[in-house]
């Protein structure tokens, strides 16, 4: 089939006193095959600081999969999301506290 | 972990249909996969198909192709699934469960209702 | 479709004996994004089934550690190291990576 490029949702929810997990979902996306990881000043957190899930079809003959981490509040600006998807990347930045949510479609 | 609470019993004639419901709480509806399942008294479990609440797409058994629709309502968090001509082999306990996909866990039925029982009678 | 295979088919224990129960698949379970969904559940009489183990080896929250997961390729095993009164009723083994999501056909775990 052909390429159809993920969704890219970065949202954030309060985790502790201090802290802050943020949450960076891939919807929509096939083949199934990507890469997503969170970054911080541009180099990937080591994997036993992120956590995975798995890539899941959606019902509708495309995948979905998210990749979240802990984070210290205030320090948001610091991290990115990465993904690359058939030859296509971007980055994705973590909203501010007032906006929970992010979308970005890439073709 | 959420409530699944599941519609009472049913007792309904062969041929006819029925509509069985999963009215959900305590967690976000749209992050989850809902599966429903089959079994018979003293028997083990079939599954029939799952609908992802996020977007509505489903996969099914093929078993269950002509026999089940799976369909949910974001606003009032419930997952349905509609049974139709029915007959004496439909008699059974109907379950709902769920996979909270932004959960810890990658299991498919992490957190079951209670079972609806379908008996099908002349 | 994927069948999984059971034994024993009943498994009388006295309280505080190690069980194990054994699950073959008919076919390799890895899905196609490289994780085994190979699960065991139990349910007691009346009740709904209850996740245990997910993913071959991992203990569901609050699942006591007695209960262990483990195998590979097409051949699983329950082990609970210590039977307890709570224990008892029917375990399935479950695949959900290929579809039909298949069960096995349930093991009985009941008192000698």
């Known amino acids: 089939g052909s390429t159809v490029p993920p969704m890219v949702n970065v949202t954030r929810s309060e985790a502790s006193e201090g802290n802050i997990t943020v949450t960076c979902r891939a919807s929509g996306f096939y083949p199934w095959n990507i890469t997503l990881s969170w970054r911080q000043d541009g180099v990937s957190l080591s994997h036993d600081t992120q956590q995975w899930g798995d890539v899941l079809p959606d019902g509708n003959g495309t995948y979905q999969t998210w990749v979240a981490t802990r984070i210290c509040q205030g320090e948001e600006q610091r991290f990115t999301c990465y993904m690359e998807h058939s030859g296509n990347h971007s980055t994705h930045p973590v909203p501010s506290g007032n906006s929970h949510h992010h979308h970005h479609h890439h073709h | 972990q959420g409530q699944m609470q599941q519609s009472g019993a049913e007792l309904v004639k062969p041929g006819a249909s029925v509509k069985l419901s999963c009215k959900t709480s305590?967690?976000?509806?749209?992050?989850?996969?809902i599966s429903w399942l089959k079994q018979k008294p003293g028997q083990s479990l079939e599954w029939i198909a799952w609908?992802?609440?996020?977007?509505?797409?489903?996969s099914y058994n093929q078993k269950f192709r002509d026999k089940a629709q799976l369909t949910v309502d974001t606003s009032s968090r419930t997952a349905y699934m509609q049974l139709s001509s029915l007959t004496t082999e439909d008699s059974a306990i109907y379950y709902c469960?769920?996979?909270?996909?932004?959960?810890?866990?990658?299991?498919?039925?992490?957190?079951w209702g209670r079972g609806t029982l379908v008996t099908v009678s002349a | 479709d994927v069948l999984m295979t059971q034994t024993p088919l009943s498994l009388p224990v006295s309280l505080g004996d190690q069980a194990s129960i054994s699950c073959r698949s008919s076919q390799h379970i890895v899905h196609s994004n490289e994780n085994t969904y190979l699960e065991w559940y139990l349910q007691k009489p009346g009740q709904s089934p209850k996740l245990l183990i997910y993913?071959?080896?991992n203990r569901f929250s609050g699942v006591p550690d007695r209960f262990s997961g483990s195998g590979s390729g097409t051949d699983f095993t329950l082990k609970i190291s210590r039977v307890e009164a709570e224990d008892l009723g029917v375990y399935y083994c479950f695949q959900g990576s290929h579809v039909p999501w298949t069960f096995g056909g349930g093991t009985k775990v009941e008192i000698k």
């Open positions: 609908i992802y609440a996020g977007t509505g797409g489903s």
């Open positions: 305590g967690f976000t509806f749209s992050d989850n996969y």
């Open positions: 993913k071959v080896s």
């Open positions: 469960a769920r996979h909270d996909y932004y959960g810890t866990s990658g299991a498919w039925f992490a957190y």
